[in-house]
Interface confidence: low
Amino acid sequence: MMTGTIETTGNISAEKGGSIILQCHLSSTTAQVTQVNWEQQDQLLAICNADLGWHISPSFKDRVAPGPGLGLTLQSLTVNDTGEYFCIYHTYPDGTYTGRIFLEVLESSVAEHGARFQIP
């Protein structure tokens, strides 16, 4: 039975040209996290593999940085980065947990950031 839950940064906004941290946290389960995939719609951004470490998709390597933790930092944001992002936790023995984050990249300099998220 899957007892875990994913906490995410939720809906966030950031300024064009700036950077943002996408963060998820899996709680309420003792399952082992074997891999975390970060995806944007149907594109794979990055993998954090317990065995093999971080790998950033080649098409994003100039604008995506691993961390902090299992999170992902997006840099040099453009309006085209607006959209849904997913953290997909592959765990054993539970299976797969998915968290959703909606990012809005604003032209304006008055982007309102969501509440700061911290990993417990």
């Epitope: 993998i47 593999n49 065995d51 093999l52 054993y92």
Partner: antibody, heavy 116, light 110 residues
Framework: QVQLQESGPGLVKPSETLSLTCTVS????????MSWIRQPPGKGLEWIGI?????NTYYANWAKGRVTISKSSNQVSLKLSSVTAADTAVYYC????????????WGQGTLVTVSS | DIQMTQSPSSLSASVGDRVTITCQAS??????LAWYQQKPGKAPKLLIY???TLASGVPSRFSGSGSGTDFTLTISSLQPEDFATYYC????????????FGQGTKVEIK
């Protein structure tokens, strides 16, 4: 003594699934990376994929969607679906392959022919 | 993707010759490189790992050097049993990879 032995059918029909097993002895899969490699007749080595100590897998770009590597206590399995004549090759398993001390040792290899 | 390019693809040499094979990675792989020897009908045999460390039981006439993108396998004095095909292999990255091996270099008798 560390040993690897590939086994499986030597003949597979086109469009079917190729299934091979690598049986290991002398070391533990729980602390080892394991790779599958193939070599078409008269050609070079082609990497198929790797399975990590905790069961995580990475596959070659050309094999994604067709290949599955899994493991049990002392065996590593390779499944390659929808095979064609181009998949005819000698298939090897080897210990290591990712930031380790090279792939060593290798199994002796098993020839798989895809033909109707 | 990381591409591994070996050169030459083949070479002819005589017993006693010094032979050099090069391998170039399309991006920095630090020292995560291995070299293998393969004889016809046999499985590849590990010669060198971490770019320059000699594998157990490998004769000292084999040596490896390089880091980053450019690597070299040298056979200081070619012996009759060294006529074979040699492959380099990057161990740096296994995600989004087409092939970890170079295309091979066949060392033939002149």
């Amino acid at each position: 003594q560390v040993q690897l032995q590939e086994s499986g059918p030597g003949l597979v029909k086109p469009s079917e699934t190729l299934s091979l097993t690598c049986t290991v002895s002398g070391f533990s899969l729980s602390s080892s990376y394991m790779s599958w490699i193939r070599q078409p007749p008269g050609k070079g080595l082609e990497w198929i994929g790797i399975i990590g100590s905790n069961g995580n897998t990475y596959y070659a770009n050309w094999a994604k969607g067709r290949v599955t590597i899994s493991k049990s206590s002392n065996q590593v399995s390779l499944k390659l679906s929808s095979v064609t004549a181009a998949d005819t090759a000698v298939y090897y398993c080897a210990r290591g392959g990712y930031r380790t001390s090279g792939m060593d040792p290798w199994g002796q290899g098993t020839l798989v022919t895809v033909s109707s | 993707d990381i591409q591994m390019t070996q050169s030459p693809s083949s070479l002819s040499a005589s017993v006693g010759d010094r032979v050099t094979i090069t391998c170039q990675a399309s991006q920095n792989i630090y020292s995560d490189l291995a070299w293998y020897q393969q004889k016809p009908g046999k499985a590849p045999k590990l010669l060198i790992y971490r770019a320059s460390t000699l594998a157990s039981g490998v004769p000292s006439r084999f040596s490896g050097s390089g880091s980053g993108t450019d690597f070299t396998l040298t056979i200081s004095s070619l012996q009759p049993e060294d006529f074979a095909t040699y492959y380099c292999q990057q161990e740096h990255l296994v995600a989004w990879i087409y092939n970890v091996f170079g295309q091979g270099t066949k060392v033939e008798i002149k």
